[in-house]
């Protein structure tokens, strides 16, 4: 005869496990009993249950209401018995002894796993902006036993590093991922993917990007200097720029105060019929949290009259 | 208290064949093998075979494979070993027997048959 | 089948003396077993796995040996040891018996 059993069992924290022990021996033999004990290395073997083929399951205090026999039908060659409820601190070696007549008795052991699956973590940097160097996007970390893989996923190009420390049932993974700021990686998720044998299926934690930056502003309206004549209706400015946050606008005139009449709406600077007050040099200022931008425009209203058109400046400063 | 009671002692011709009982008590009938072993006079023992009542599951040494048929009658509690096509060689003391564990390992026997085979 | 060899078949031996008997197996086995048989009464399991005591049995019996061969011993021969003891093994089918070794006292 010869017992079977796993080299390996492995349980979840929390689950249940079932540690095997079944003899396969001739069938005129008889089992008396199964000793289950503990024997961890250097440690002396810590009793945890006698199944007996008369009286049944005896547990031994130290275990008392976790250990049970696997529920009926049950064959008497079998000696597994279930573990209640699986903690860190019963991962180790067991031994299950056989006590079997005519054949004798019969030992085996057995190493039990117990996983604990990660809770990981996801912290972002510092805030990022157009214009830093290599910079912390965002770390995650993730303990576990055994020691979990923290991977990420993202569309957009960076670098990662990882560290490891270990406890002493368990080991905490941080990898940070690293990147280059720049205004096209907003919005972009970043995603931290984190691998376990305890884990049906990978946890994954999702991080937009926010990427602060501010473009150069620009002004539209006096592409055809011509439409820029007295009398006319409707004649407008219009800055241009994009940001994160988005930006906001505000109007001057660099010679003087706004003409009567103009009207700024956000970005937009509206004008009643054109005068010839209403020439001068416009000032677009565009501001967000990470920075500021000017961008200037020379109006010169023509007059019908005048029969030499003049020229219009266009300069954006910053 | 387990007890193993045999029939009663069998004077059989050459030739015929004899069916011995084996009632059992005080246990739970189902639970144990039922050991069947041979002594002739004055000589050593020899393991015929076994059955398990539970399923009716039997197991025989090579040698009584032609000679003993091994049965169970639940209703009774009684195992059976039939010999058969007798010859004087096959005069002996039959014994049933199970394993049992208590504290440690112990056989509980039938008082054993005697079977003799003479013209 | 795995035959058992018993030796001596028949030995005696005074109170108080040591006495040892050997089974010599055909083919390896795992354990042992020894069983007593006084006159025409059922045998009795005497020692099993090797080295363990039956319930009952006295401490002076004792039991050891390994792969092909084993060995009983009495320590202090005593009167109500005198029997015939027979090995016994079951790591293989068919299970089988030693002849047997007949105890007598001088």
């Known amino acids: 005869g010869e017992l079977e059993t796993s080299d390996v069992v492995t349980v979840v924290l929390g689950q249940d496990a079932k540690l095997p022990c079944f003899y396969r021996g001739d069938s005129g033999e008889q089992v008396g009993q199964v000793a289950w004990a503990r024997v961890d290395a250097g440690e002396g073997a810590q009793e945890l249950a006698l199944l007996h083929s008369k009286y049944g399951l005896h547990v031994s205090p130290a275990y008392e209401g976790r250990v049970e026999q696997p529920p009926p039908p049950r064959n008497p060659l079998d000696g597994s018995v279930l573990l209640r409820n699986a903690v860190q601190a019963d991962e180790g070696e067991y031994e299950c002894r056989v006590s079997t007549f005519p054949a004798g008795s019969f030992q085996a052991r057995l190493r039990l796993r117990v996983l604990v699956p990660p809770l990981p973590s996801l912290n972002p940097g510092p805030a990022l902006e157009e214009g830093q160097g290599l910079t912390l996007a965002a770390s995650c970390t993730a303990e576990g036993s055994p020691a979990p893989s923290v991977t990420w996923d993202t569309e957009v190009k960076g670098t990662t590093s990882s560290r490891s420390f270990k406890h002493s049932r368990s080991a905490a993974v941080t990898s940070e991922f690293h990147l280059v700021p720049s205004r096209s990686m907003n919005g972009q998720p970043l995603t931290c993917v984190v691998s376990h044998p305890g884990l049906l299926q990978d946890q994954r934690i999702t991080h937009i990007l926010h990427v602060s930056f501010l473009a150069e502003a620009s002004v539209r309206g006096l592409e055809d200097q011509n439409l820029w004549h007295i009398g006319r209706e409707g004649a407008m400015l219009k800055c241009l720029s994009e940001g994160q946050p988005p930006p906001s606008y505000n109007w001057t005139r660099l010679d003087g105060p706004l003409p009567s009449g103009v009207r700024v709406d956000g970005d937009t600077l509206g004008f009643p019929p054109l005068t010839t007050e209403h020439s001068g040099i416009y000032v677009c200022h565009v501001s967000n949290e990470f920075s500021s931008r000017d961008s200037q425009v020379t109006v010169d209203v023509l007059d019908p009259q005048e029969d030499s058109g003049k020229q219009v400046d266009l300069v954006s400063a910053s | 208290e387990v007890q193993l009671q045999q029939s009663g002692p069998e004077l059989v011709k050459p030739g015929a064949s004899v069916k011995i009982a084996c009632r059992a008590s005080g246990y739970t009938f189902t639970a144990y093998n039922i050991h069947w072993v041979s002594q002739r006079h004055g000589k050593s023992l020899e393991w015929i075979g076994y059955?398990?009542?539970?399923?009716?599951?039997?197991g025989y040494n090579q040698k009584f494979m032609n000679k003993a048929t091994l049965t169970v009658d639940h209703s009774s509690n009684t195992a059976y070993m039939e010999l058969r096509s007798l010859t004087s060689e096959d005069s002996a003391v039959y014994y049933c027997?199970?394993?049992?564990?208590?504290?440690?390992?112990?056989?509980?026997w039938g008082q054993g048959t005697l079977v003799t085979v003479s013209a | 089948e795995n035959v058992l060899t018993q030796s001596p078949e028949i030995m005696s031996a005074s109170p108080g003396e040591e006495v040892t008997m050997t089974c010599s197996a055909s083919s390896s086995v795992s354990y042992m077993h020894w069983f007593q048989q006084k006159s025409t009464i059922s045998p009795k399991l005497w020692i099993y796995d090797t080295s363990k005591l039956a319930s009952g049995v006295p401490g002076r019996f004792s039991g050891s040996g390994s792969g092909k061969s084993y060995s009983l011993t009495i320590r202090n021969m005593e009167a109500e040891d005198v029997a015939t003891y027979y090995c016994?093994?079951?790591?293989?089918?068919?299970?089988?018996f030693g002849g047997g070794t007949k105890l007598e006292i001088k």
């Open positions: 027997a199970i394993f049992d564990y208590d504290e440690a390992w112990f056989i509980y």
């Open positions: 059955i398990y009542p539970n399923n009716g599951g039997s």
């Open positions: 016994f093994q079951g790591s293989g089918s068919p299970y089988t």
